[in-house]
């Protein structure tokens, strides 16, 4: 038996007073830029590498991790001024005598070509065209990253119109 038109009308009116769940969406927070499966935030101020690391943590994110040359190129394409550079999440581990990402993995020899010294207290920054090492105490801008997250958008059906 089909429901009466009147009943259907009442159901719709009742639902309008509730929120309705849309399908799950992949969203970046406001001010963050989406780059494939990541959200990136480019700082406006400068800090030593350690403070940059801490700032990203307070934003529930990390300093940028770069997986390959393609991701490096995509990120560098977002740097619109060749006169500005940004810290990333890579520094020199004296104990292991190797470049180490902040997630604990080591730099593969063919990932990034770093210009500069591999020595104690060296951290890595990127510019529009290059990747450099520098004293970690140097004050520079930095890039935080978040993985793209599922956001359940709760909206009123009226706003769909």
């Amino acid at each position: 038996q089909k429901p009466s038109i009147g009943k259907c009308s009442v159901d719709i009116q009742q639902n309008r007073t509730k929120t309705t769940e849309r399908p799950d969406l992949l969203n970046c927070p406001i001010y963050w830029q989406q780059v494939q499966e990541k959200c990136l935030l480019f700082s406006h101020t400068v800090n030593p590498w350690n403070n940059s690391l801490a700032d990203c943590s307070t934003k529930e994110s990390s300093l940028l991790l770069i997986q390959d040359k393609d991701e490096l190129t995509r990120t560098q394409n977002l740097i619109h001024d060749k006169a500005i550079s940004f810290w990333i999440g890579l520094n020199f581990s004296l104990s292991e005598k190797n470049w180490k990402w902040i997630n604990g993995s080591f730099l593969s020899s063919n990932d990034l070509k770093i210009t500069g010294d591999a020595k104690e207290n060296s951290c890595v920054y990127i510019s529009q065209t290059s990747v450099y090492s520098e004293y970690c105490s140097t004050e520079m801008k930095w890039i935080c990253q978040k993985e793209l997250t599922l956001v359940r958008n709760k909206v009123s059906p009226d706003s769909w119109l």
């Epitope: 060749k82 006169a83 500005i84 004293y135 140097t138 004050e139 801008k141």
Partner: antibody, heavy 122, light 108 residues
Framework: QVQLVESGGGLVKPGGSLRLSCAAS????????MSWIRQAPGKGLEWVSY????????AYADSVKGRFTISRDNAKNSLYLQMNSLRAEDTAVYYC???????????????WGRGTLVTVSS | DIQLTQSPSSVSASVGDRVTITCRAS??????LAWYQQKPGKAPKLLIY???ELQSGVPSRFSGSGSGTDFTLTISSLQPEDFATYYC??????????FGGGTKVEIK
């Protein structure tokens, strides 16, 4: 507009003191490494000192170490150079200079003031 | 300290000429070198940094090359406003940041 303006130069006797100031405008001063660079009359350029954006890191040329003190006030967009125990060889035009942001402590000077003349003479 | 030696100390040239100035470092500085132009009574102006990067707003007739200890500034076609003194500067990440002695480009 984007500019640096030095002041505080003048004539001072050997052993005397002088404080130079540099007023920055048109850019986010607190993001930049700043330096003082000098040029003796008819001579070349000599870097004197730099200070990091927060003021946490400072360096001096050997020729002024222990006599000159660099400082900054980011709230006032100002850079300073306190010069004590001045000598005749400190006579020069003193320039305030901003460093290119792209290269960390590899300092390239992309914005200069017009300079202020310091003359040390008895 | 790293010393920079510029040559020649002066050069006479005409408008339209190609002018080359060299800068030699006393030890290797990778590509950490800049070139500046200074006119009488004026502050220096950054032309080239990181040995070959053209500073924003600088005409493309200026170019830089080199790495290690030997560097070159080239003006491909000299213009009237290019008559000035040119300085190189090394920018290794430890001070002092030394300058070359300068090269004066004069009208022939």
């Amino acid at each position: 507009q984007v500019q640096l303006v030095e002041s505080g130069g003048g004539l001072v006797k050997p052993g005397g003191s002088l404080r130079l100031s540099c007023a920055a405008s048109g850019f986010t001063f607190a993001n930049y490494y700043m330096s003082w660079i000098r040029q003796a009359p008819g001579k070349g350029l000599e870097w004197v000192s730099y200070i990091s954006p927060s003021g946490a890191t400072i360096a001096y040329a050997d020729s002024v170490k222990g006599r000159f003190t660099i400082s900054r006030d980011n709230a006032k967009n100002s850079l300073y150079l306190q010069m004590n125990s001045l000598r005749a060889e400190d006579t020069a035009v003193y320039y305030c200079a901003r460093s290119l942001m792209a290269t960390g402590t590899h300092l390239y000077f992309d914005l200069w003031g017009r300079g202020t003349l310091v003359t040390v003479s008895s | 300290d790293i010393q920079l030696t510029q040559s020649p100390s002066s050069v006479s040239a005409s408008v339209g000429d190609r002018v080359t100035i060299t800068c030699r470092a006393s030890s290797g500085i990778s590509s950490w070198l800049a070139w500046y132009q200074q006119k009488p009574g004026k502050a220096p102006k950054l032309l080239i940094y990181a040995a070959s990067e053209l500073q924003s707003g600088v005409p493309s007739r200026f170019s830089g090359s080199g790495s290690g200890t030997d560097f070159t500034l080239t003006i491909s076609s000299l213009q009237p406003e290019d008559f000035a003194t040119y300085y190189c500067q090394q920018a290794t990440s430890f001070p002092p940041y030394t300058f070359g002695g300068g090269t004066k480009v004069e009208i022939k």
